[in-house]
Amino acid sequence: DGHGGSWEQLIQERRSHQNNPAAHLTGANSSLTGSGGPLLWETQLGLAFLRGLDYHDGALVANKAGYYYIYSKVQLGGVGCPLGLASTITHGLYKRTPRYPEELELLVSQQSPCGRATSNSRVWWDSSFLGGVVHLEVGEEVVVRVLDERLVRLRDGTRSYFGAFMV
Amino acid sequence: DGHGGSWEQLIQERRSHQNNPAAHLTGANSSLTGSGGPLLWETQLGLAFLRGLDYHDGALVANKAGYYYIYSKVQLGGVGCPLGLASTITHGLYKRTPRYPEELELLVSQQSPCGRATSNSRVWWDSSFLGGVVHLEVGEEVVVRVLDERLVRLRDGTRSYFGAFMV
Amino acid sequence: DGHGGSWEQLIQERRSHQNNPAAHLTGANSSLTGSGGPLLWETQLGLAFLRGLDYHDGALVANKAGYYYIYSKVQLGGVGCPLGLASTITHGLYKRTPRYPEELELLVSQQSPCGRATSNSRVWWDSSFLGGVVHLEVGEEVVVRVLDERLVRLRDGTRSYFGAFMV
């Protein structure tokens, strides 16, 4: 009967999922730094939360090793495009690990949204969604990058976001 | 040894995931009401199911508090567009809660798909996918809205859908 | 006290998710066969892995019955389009089951990406993401198909991929 405490805890864990790492971070005015770094995110206000994951300078940080479904959406838009109709946007999720000096590409999309904007109507909107399962060791980080960052439209945290949960 | 029943149940739960709330709802002819309300969904036929979540007038309703990965895809398409290249489509997931009188935006995308129709062939297709983790209390509801609903193409439940599962 | 082994195993399972089926397969040079069959995938190298799911000729195969969140992303791109600017791309996830002779559509998207290529710059990029919850019995398979396959761009496994996990 020495299992008592663990037993109750296990039932509680199973029922509530309370210990399953999960996070949803939202876009904010400070997300776009223009510094060449990753996007930064809101972690507490509104819809944003961290449960069993940490946050550091734009990165979600694993506290527990395992497989995670990671995802990000970015809202793109503009009036015309910086490079004209040939503009390509790259939206990606990247891993930082102490075991390797450079960021590792995990999930990446390329889009050419500006072909939609013409001389008559140069306003356009587009969206990019990425999601997939990756393995993270304790302390490994995942960040979001968008090139060209100038085309990301932020508003209220619902249109551009970044999250993860253990599977 | 009073743990017996619960113990077996717990093993069964863990192994089968049978009690983890999940749902996948599919588009149907009745999905588009033209009334300004949310999209309606098929809950039983074909690929559609509800497990530990309820459905009411287009909404997935939480029976258990927690964090849920919610998602929706809508198939967009048309022959030309009502507002030409300026036509914008907004696809969103929204929360209804007794604690607040208005729907709360959770995950939203804006797209300008009509630039995909070329000079002669006015036919175009586009797709919008949303997914992210949100917290739901018991009784809170999530709905899908698309503006302009006229541009949603329904067929067989595989192209437009709405789902969730607890994480 | 006859529960000892199972008890420890259960705690271990709960804590590590080690027995929850999951997979992430990545695009490779051999993915596009041109044979009219499904896309083929890398299962071991780089980011690819299988945990509690099998792989066979492009298909993820369920070893355990239940509901799975299945997903795929394909990177599309080209210089112009094979059928001119009206080209439509269909990206889908399909189920193969011994109980039915034909593949069953699960999740499907249609896109007209070539409208993004203009007369000045005929290079275009687009991306298609699908994800949703479906039920799989033991031995049932899920495959990815893209029509027109010629428009899928492979590089390093980060832009086109296919995965699943039990929910």
């Epitope: 008559n120 | 022959v79 030309g80 009502p82 507002l83 030409g84 290249l85 002669n120 006015r122 036919v123 | -």
Partner: antibody
Framework: QVQLQQSGAEMASPGASVTLSCKAS????????MNWVKKRPGQGLEWIGR????????NYNQKFMGKATFSVDRSSSTVYMVLNSLTSEDPAVYYC????????????WGQGTTLTVSS | DIVMTQSPASLAVSLGQRATISCKAS??????????MNWYQQKPGQPPKLLIY???NLESGIPARFSGSGSGTDFTLNIHPVEEEDAATYYC?????????FGGGTKLEIK
């Protein structure tokens, strides 16, 4: 009620230009496409093109490129069509037709403007 | 351009009988289960009036004696029972591709 009021009959000389107007009322002007259609005596209907009042974007029938030019004045809910370099092929009745809610048909029409070209 | 061929060019139908007008497109005007085919009525000195949109949908305010059918390339307008006021020229029109094109018209005379 929806009404499209077109300008009165026009007479012009060969080589000249003429501006036809179509004033909309009874609905939200920017929410509907406006099309222009030509009807020559004893012949069928010909679609000239369309304008999207919300943006001013235009699409023309290749046959009328360089012949017709559309514009919009949102403040007065009016669309215009300029026909230039008039020839003997241009005399006709010109109609504006509003794009329907599902935008690929014309559900309301102006009464038409008769254009005569005479030297 | 998509060519719309209407037949017959003219027809005379007795009051109360059925008038059938055919329209053939040079290529399919279907998209995702919908047919982008419309029918208009035009009387002398008047603008055209929309009768049927998307091949078979009756425009608001149009009498139920008008009906449309067909898909792909072959379409039909039926009027039954024909009334005196139906004397007019009828046009089919496709809107799947630019330029929109009309059939040559069918002149209906009531006997």
């Amino acid at each position: 009620q929806v009404q499209l009021q077109q300008s009165g009959a026009e007479m012009a000389s060969p080589g000249a230009s003429v501006t036809l107007s179509c004033k909309a009322s009874g609905y939200t002007f920017i929410d509907h496409i406006m099309n222009w259609v030509k009807k020559r005596p004893g012949q069928g209907l010909e679609w000239i093109g369309r304008i999207y009042p919300v943006s001013g974007e235009t699409n023309y029938n290749q046959k009328f490129m360089g012949k017709a030019t559309f514009s919009v004045d949102r403040s007065s809910s009016t669309v215009y069509m300029v026909l230039n370099s008039l020839t003997s092929e241009d005399p006709a009745v010109y109609y504006c037709g509003r794009g329907s809610y599902y935008w690929n048909a014309m559900d309301y029409w102006g009464q038409g403007t008769t254009l005569t070209v005479s030297s | 351009d998509i060519v719309m061929t209407q037949s017959p060019a003219s027809l005379a139908v007795s009051l109360g009988q059925r008038a059938t007008i055919s329209c053939k497109a040079s290529q399919s005007v279907d998209f995702d289960g919908d047919s982008y085919m419309n029918w208009y009525q035009q009387k002398p000195g008047q603008p055209p009036k929309l009768l049927i949109y998307s091949a078979s949908n009756l425009e608001s305010g149009i009498p139920a004696r008008f009906s449309g059918s067909g898909s792909g390339t072959d379409f039909t307008l039926n009027i039954h029972p024909v009334e005196e006021e139906d004397a007019a020229t009828y046009y089919c029109q496709q809107s799947i591709e630019d330029p929109w094109t009309f059939g040559g018209g069918t002149k209906l005379e009531i006997k």
